[in-house]
């Protein structure tokens, strides 16, 4: 990338240089960095045109254009581990020098979907064709290359150097040559704008004569945002030419004096600046240079201007337009931040509400608070949520898990709880016996009793009636098969002692459904579940112990 093939374009507040070189993206970026720049950004169509201009310069310097495609690195890259994001204009890529993502893009084709590898972007050029202003180079993404292996068709790179301001090119009022040396070590004689801190070497004269004089100037910031050379009057003036050479070096009007001297002047509405060459608008804001809601503020002495944005907006890279500030980048909220035009708002996650110390803070909503509990029975508040629980004998139900449903212990997975008949109740169950049998004191077994016809018998008295234990059942859990039936004293949790009290749902039974005397028989009452007889139950002589069971498919079957 020698100086003999330098190409440079300066515009706005930046200069672009284009270079030949089969280098990796990292090597190219290092070369740009060495001179205080970065691989170029292409954040707008205007910037794309500047980059195209500098590439056109570079291609003109190539003696013979070859019929091939060539790629030139720009500063758009996606780091390892950052995935392609089709929802964004830059597809998850970002500019190496930093700065905001912009809506402009010019992708060549659909991008390769990847996350693992670092990916870099180059401008794709047909090196056999002259660059046309209407056809801006397309962006091509691919591997970033490595030293000695830059990647396929990589021919060079474009750097960008940003400055606080620019000086106008020096205008000569007579024959001479200006050579600019920029802070990024480029020399040029044809810059449309010259960056701050550049040096200008002016050699006056025809060049082949000995009457040449040399002048040396520096582009300085004369006042805030006012940049000029500190020269006064046109350079290399010659009475021989007067206003006829390059308009005397004047920006607008040139007035000749009778003695061969001349002066520069300005048109109505403009005034002559301190360099006695350049004209500036009396009101620099008269041309409405600021856009996007920005306010134009004239600079001192009617020179230059600055654009100012309303609160919540900031100037973009052109310093003329306002773009929304994404306040959410600074994480001002405790939980969720929503950026809005000119502002932002904080939101809380489900289960939280605004409140607590600090701006944008969120506090847990106590869903279990008095009067707002969504649960039918137990409610436990948790951070950002809650969960419902049920008393023993119930399980969580309902599509949102807030209701409690009675567990039918008589069909529980733990096997039979009663030796003969089982009656489900709200939150519990009771045992009973078939005609001719009575419930044993343990409330579970059946013992042979006086023969009688009628409904199944319950326990002999109320002595076992006790409180049901109030421990909760975890969500989706089933009732423990070891839990005793209603009426079991707490002191004997291992013994199942069901109770059939006077309010038990028993209906009288027609004689024809009863089994022959002396047999436990089959009790077919829809609300009653039959279980296998316990081994301890007495069996009448000569009688079969025929017991009803419930099959897995929910139908009754006889064992």
């Amino acid at each position: 990338t020698g100086a003999d093939t330098e190409a440079v374009v300066c515009a706005g507040t930046a200069c672009y240089t284009a270079h030949w070189g089969k280098l990796s993206a990292a090597e190219a970026q290092n070369l740009c960095l060495q001179n205080g720049g970065n691989l170029a950004t292409v954040k707008s169509e205007e910037e794309a045109q500047h980059v195209q201009q500098v590439l056109a310069q570079l291609l003109r310097r190539e003696a013979a254009l070859t019929a091939r495609m060539g790629k030139f690195w720009i500063g758009l890259q996606r780091e390892k581990g950052k995935c392609l994001d089709p929802s964004l204009p830059l597809k998850g890529f970002s500019w190496v020098g930093g700065g905001e993502d912009t809506p402009y893009s010019n992708w060549h084709k659909e991008l390769r979907n990847s996350c693992i590898s670092k990916r870099c972007v180059s401008l794709l050029l047909d090196l056999s064709q002259p660059l046309l202003p209407g056809r801006l180079p397309k962006w091509s993404e691919g591997p970033c290359g490595s030293p000695g292996s830059p990647g396929s068709n990589i021919e060079g790179f474009v750097c960008k150097f940003s400055f606080k301001g620019m000086c106008r090119p020096l205008a000569l009022g007579g024959p001479g040559q200006v050579t600019y040396t920029t802070p990024f070590q480029t020399t040029s004689s044809s810059l449309e704008a010259v960056p701050f801190a550049s040096a200008a070497n002016v050699a006056c004269g025809e060049g082949d004569k000995d009457d040449s004089q040399s002048h040396y100037f520096l582009c300085k910031e004369k006042a805030p945002d006012v940049f000029d050379w500190g020269s006064s009057g046109p350079l290399c003036v010659s009475p021989k030419y007067g206003c006829n050479f390059n308009n005397g070096g004047c920006h607008q009007d040139c007035f000749e004096g009778g003695d061969g001297s001349f002066l520069c002047g300005c048109r109505p509405g403009f005034r002559l600046l301190d360099d006695l060459v350049t004209c500036a608008s009396r009101n620099p804001c008269s041309s409405s240079p600021c856009r996007g809601g920005a306010t134009c503020i004239p600079g001192p002495h009617g020179k230059n201007y600055t654009c100012r944005c309303p609160q919540g907006y900031q100037l973009d890279s052109s310093q003329l337009d306002c773009v929304d500030v994404d306040e959410c980048q600074d994480s001002p909220c405790a939980q969720e931040c929503v950026n809005t035009p000119g502002s932002f708002r904080c939101e809380c996650w489900v289960g939280y509400e605004p409140g607590g110390p600090g701006e944008g803070a969120c506090q847990d909503v106590d869903e279990c608070a008095l009067g707002r509990s969504p649960c039918a029975q137990g409610c436990t508040n948790t951070e950002g949520s809650f969960h419902c629980s049920c008393e023993e004998g119930y399980v969580l139900a309902g599509e949102d898990g807030t209701q409690c449903q009675d567990v039918d212990e008589c069909v529980g997975p733990g096997g039979p709880l009663c030796d003969s008949l089982c009656f489900n109740t709200q939150g519990s169950f009771r045992c009973g016996c078939l005609p001719g049998w009575v419930l044993a004191p343990n409330g579970v077994s059946c013992a042979m009793g006086p023969v009688s016809l009628g409904p199944p018998s319950g326990p002999p008295d109320e002595e076992y009636k006790g409180e049901r234990e109030g421990s909760t059942v975890p969500p989706a859990a089933t009732a423990s098969p070891t839990r005793g039936p209603e009426g079991t004293p707490k002191s004997t949790p291992t013994t199942r002692r069901p109770l059939l009290s006077s309010d038990a749902p028993i209906t009288s039974v027609p004689l024809e459904v009863l089994a022959p005397s002396g047999s436990p028989g089959l009790w077919r009452e829809p609300s009653i579940h039959h279980t296998t007889a316990a081994s301890g139950a007495q069996e009448p002589a000569g009688g079969d112990s025929s017991v009803a069971t419930q099959n897995d498919d929910g139908t009754d079957g006889q064992k």
Epitope: K80, G81, C83, L84, D85, P86, S87, R112, N113, S114, C115, I116, S117, K118, P143
Partner: antibody, heavy 120, light 108 residues
Framework: QVQLQQSGADLVRPGASVKLSCKAS????????MHWVKQTPVYGLEWIGG????????AYNQNFKGKATLTADKSSSAAYMELRSLTSEDSAVYYC?????????????WGQGTSVTVSS | ENVLTQSPAIMSASPGEKVTMTCRAS???????LHWYQQKSGASPKLWIY???NLAFGVPARFSGSGSGTSYSLTISSVEAEDAATYYC?????????FGSGTKLEIK
């Protein structure tokens, strides 16, 4: 259509190494990354790492660095995972997977899995 | 690493019921990078919902997904027998990719 065909089940001795293969078909092999996932009853699904066949670049879960090495062979359109210094903890089903044309690491295609049993 | 916690671990539902399972992340996840997989016994996982709410090809419309930040959920509006499976959430917010421990859905 995209298919990922994995090598058969392996029974290996503790301390040994094993190399699992995943042959891709139905697409251009270098277009999609290939990732590997381990499944055990205790730890469920664990991402081991991935490889970009175009560049050979890899990304690993720190928990598997030194245990797994990922490679890809463009000529045979196959991805490989070598597991070394095997212990009973490495007994698992291993899947190769990729996200095809979907974005954001949504794994759209999965191999049938290779069961590795480490036992003496 | 970003740990995903799924709840409940096991759930049971009758056909026609609506069910919701949740996935909580230990740190925020972009909704684009949160996905759900269905796995049936002896089979490979299948992508079921991608980028929080997009149904993968062939997934019935009774499935839906929602969420943002650290809290995400998968809902089945009316469960069918064929939905019995284990559902895993998965996220990417920088390496490593992580999966949830799964929610096993049983049909009564």
């Amino acid at each position: 259509q995209v298919q990922l065909q994995q090598s058969g089940a392996d029974l290996v001795r503790p301390g040994a190494s094993v190399k699992l293969s995943c042959k891709a078909s139905g697409y251009t092999f270098t277009d999609y990354e290939m990732h590997w996932v381990k499944q055990t009853p205790v730890y469920g699904l664990e991402w081991i790492g991935g490889i970009d066949p175009e560049t050979g670049d890899t990304a690993y879960n720190q928990n598997f660095k030194g245990k797994a090495t990922l490679t890809a062979d463009k000529s045979s359109s196959a991805a490989y995972m070598e597991l070394r210094s095997l212990t009973s903890e490495d007994s698992a089903v291993y899947y190769c997977t990729n996200y095809g044309n979907l974005y954001y690491y949504a794994m759209d295609y999965w191999g049938q899995g290779t069961s590795v049993t480490v036992s003496s | 690493e970003n740990v995903l916690t799924q709840s409940p671990a096991i759930m049971s539902a009758s056909p026609g019921e609506k069910v919701t399972m949740t996935c909580r992340a230990s740190s925020s996840v972009s909704s684009s990078y949160l996905h759900w997989y269905q796995q049936k016994s002896g089979a490979s996982p299948k992508l079921w919902i991608y980028s929080t709410s997009n149904l993968a090809f062939g997934v019935p419309a009774r499935f839906s997904g929602s969420g943002s930040g650290t809290s995400y959920s998968l809902t089945i509006s009316s469960v069918e027998a064929e939905d019995a499976a284990t559902y895993y959430c998965q996220q990417y917010s920088g390496y490593p990719l992580t999966f949830g421990s799964g929610t096993k859905l049983e049909i009564k």
